[in-house]
């Protein structure tokens, strides 16, 4: 590959690539060094090459770009800005590239970007404006339809003194740019809670994956606005029970399939409504696999086989009768 590159956008919001301008006219559809390109498939793969920056000389035809398994560390503003822009780029996979910092406007000037995968990067510093590109209260709509953010939680010693959940949600909600998002995957992020406003502001969601987190309760989460939701993955969390409000909301979603396997269900008197609902509903996939984890006497009992007599709560003793 010769040292020419596609000239960059000169937008002030993309200063990084404003210097990636070729010294002579760019070869129109050259393949960057260390990458594999297929013009027929409109695909460029720069995979497991220890790249520390996004290649500057990406071919204009690229529709699918794989930059996985690299050492990018940081995505600055306008990391993919080019002149002419990468107008066809629709799917961008950056998984496993040691990114820990994604700045505001990192994905600007990608007018066709529909799928973005940032999974398996320890994102200690995800800008609130990473996806919206601006700090306006209402941004231009993002073209993103699918956002994959599985296992982006950094190691505990690298997390900042702020809520990781809050940082991610701020990026999802900024400028209401992701109103068109249909698939959101947030699996394996140690989420303890889901901020109550996040789902209400993503009304187009069809698929939501929250599996393998540490969610204890959905009490303050509302699914009511997600009228298009088709799949909700809640497997491998720390859910103890689903309460009436949540059950009713889920039942009211016309296309929903819910996945609840491998949660530590507490089969006491608070579980009665959920058991009744499970016996009647068709929305829970594999509901016959759901089993109790607590109390000890109920461990491994199948929820669908329980009746109200099984679901009791120990009476609360008055303080004078409690023993230590």
């Amino acid at each position: 590959s010769s040292p020419t590159s596609s000239a960059s956008s000169f937008s002030s919001s993309a200063p990084f690539l404003a210097s990636a301008v070729s010294a002579q006219p760019p070869l129109p559809d050259q393949c960057p060094a260390l990458c594999e390109c297929s013009e027929a498939a409109r695909t460029v793969k720069c995979v497991n090459r220890n790249l520390t920056e996004v290649p500057t000389d990406l071919p204009a035809y690229v529709r699918n770009l794989f930059l996985t398994g690299n050492q990018l560390a940081v995505l600055p503003a306008g990391a993919f800005a080019r002149r002419p822009p990468l107008a066809e780029l629709a799917a961008l996979n950056l998984s496993g590239s040691r990114l820990d910092e994604v700045r505001a406007g990192a994905f600007e000037h990608l007018p066709s970007l529909r799928q973005l995968d940032l999974s398996h990067n320890p994102l200690a510093d995800l800008s609130p404006f990473a996806f919206s590109g601006s700090n306006a209260s209402v941004s231009a709509p993002s073209p993103l339809v699918e956002l994959i953010l599985n296992h982006i939680v950094p190691p505990e010693d690298e997390r900042q003194n702020r809520s990781f959940e809050g940082m991610v949600v701020a990026a999802l909600l900024a400028g209401r740019a992701l109103q068109g998002l249909r698939r959101l995957e947030l699996a394996s992020n140690h989420f303890l809670y889901l901020p109550r406003d996040v789902l209400a502001q993503l009304p187009s969601l069809r698929h939501l994956d929250l599996s393998n987190n540490s969610l204890v309760s959905l009490t303050y989460v509302s699914f009511r606005n997600l009228t298009h939701l088709e799949s909700l993955h809640l497997e491998d969390n720390a859910l103890k029970v689903l309460h009436n409000g949540t059950l009713a909301e889920l039942q009211g979603l016309p296309h929903i399939r819910v996945f609840l396997d491998n949660n530590p269900w507490v089969c006491d008197c608070h579980m009665a409504d959920m058991v009744t609902w499970l016996k009647e509903t068709e929305v829970v996939q594999g509901k016959d696999r759901l089993t109790c984890a607590y109390p000890e006497k109920m461990r491994n009992r199948v929820l669908l086989e329980l009746n109200s007599a099984d679901l009791d709560c120990d009476p609360i003793l008055p303080p004078s009768l409690q023993t230590s």
Partner: antibody, heavy 120, light 111 residues
Framework: EVQLVESGGGLVQPGGSLRLSCAAS????????MHWVRQAPGKGLEWVSY????????YYADTVKGRFTISRDNAKNSLYLQMNSLRDEDTAVYYC?????????????WGQGTTVTVSS | DIVMTQSPDSLAVSLGERATINCRAS??????????LHWYQQKPGQPPKLLIY???NLESGVPDRFSGSGSGTDFTLTISSLQAEDVAVYYC?????????FGQGTKLEIK
């Protein structure tokens, strides 16, 4: 020991061309990004250009954009700077420098420099 | 472009005394993950030499009388006890974005 040795400098007329070279030794050249940095007589340091380890990324200062081309040959452990349409203000000592990455990196090894004089 | 401004332009300090050089960036060059600010020493007739990277990390082989601090826009290079061999010009440099830019330099002399 890390060594960077620049060559190719000299006296050239405005509008002329020069090609600078930097020979690297003492480290795995293909693992490092490389920069050119220059210093006009009696002045401070000015970043000129960068090339990534595998020649996938190239960046230039606005002052040289469209006139200078950075390249490298990892098989020869060599870095190059092709300088065309030279101007008086390009007169400087040109240093090549090593880095582990562009933004997260820094200039951790420098050559002794080669002098470029543009004058009629 | 980010402008790096050093102060003072020149500084005279007695041997064994503390020397402090400041560097200010025209915008923040820190994130919560990394600080994109580095310090170099250039002695007469020699190329620059890396002293401090990422604001406060001492480069291997650099005497520990050199230290760096700061974040955001304001940074400091400190020489705790000036030695004769520290006479040089000192530069700060950011790597936040392209173009990379240096401060104008601070000339350190012995009083």
């Amino acid at each position: 020991e890390v060594q960077l040795v620049e060559s190719g400098g000299g006296l050239v007329q405005p509008g002329g061309s020069l090609r600078l070279s930097c020979a690297a030794s003492g480290f795995t050249f293909s693992n490092f990004g490389m920069h050119w940095v220059r210093q006009a007589p009696g002045k401070g340091l000015e970043w000129v250009s960068y090339i990534s380890s595998g020649s996938t990324s190239f960046y230039y200062a606005d002052t040289v954009k469209g006139r200078f081309t950075i390249s490298r040959d990892n098989a020869k452990n060599s870095l190059y700077l092709q300088m065309n349409s030279l101007r008086d203000e390009d007169t400087a000592v040109y240093y090549c420098s090593r880095t582990n990455s562009l933004l997260r990196g820094f200039f951790d090894a420098w050559g002794q420099g080669t002098t470029v004089t543009v004058s009629s | 472009d980010i402008v790096m401004t050093q102060s003072p332009d020149s500084l005279a300090v007695s041997l064994g005394e503390r020397a402090t050089i400041n560097c200010r960036a025209s915008q923040s060059v820190s994130s919560s993950s990394y600080t994109y600010l580095h310090w170099y020493q250039q002695k007469p007739g020699q190329p620059p030499k890396l002293l401090i990277y990422s604001a406060s990390n001492l480069e291997s082989g650099v005497p520990d009388r050199f230290s760096g601090s700061g974040s955001g826009t304001d940074f400091t290079l400190t020489i705790s006890s000036l030695q004769a061999e520290d006479v040089a010009v000192y530069y700060c440099q950011h790597s936040w974005e392209i173009p990379l830019t240096f401060g104008q330099g601070t000339k350190l002399e012995i009083k």
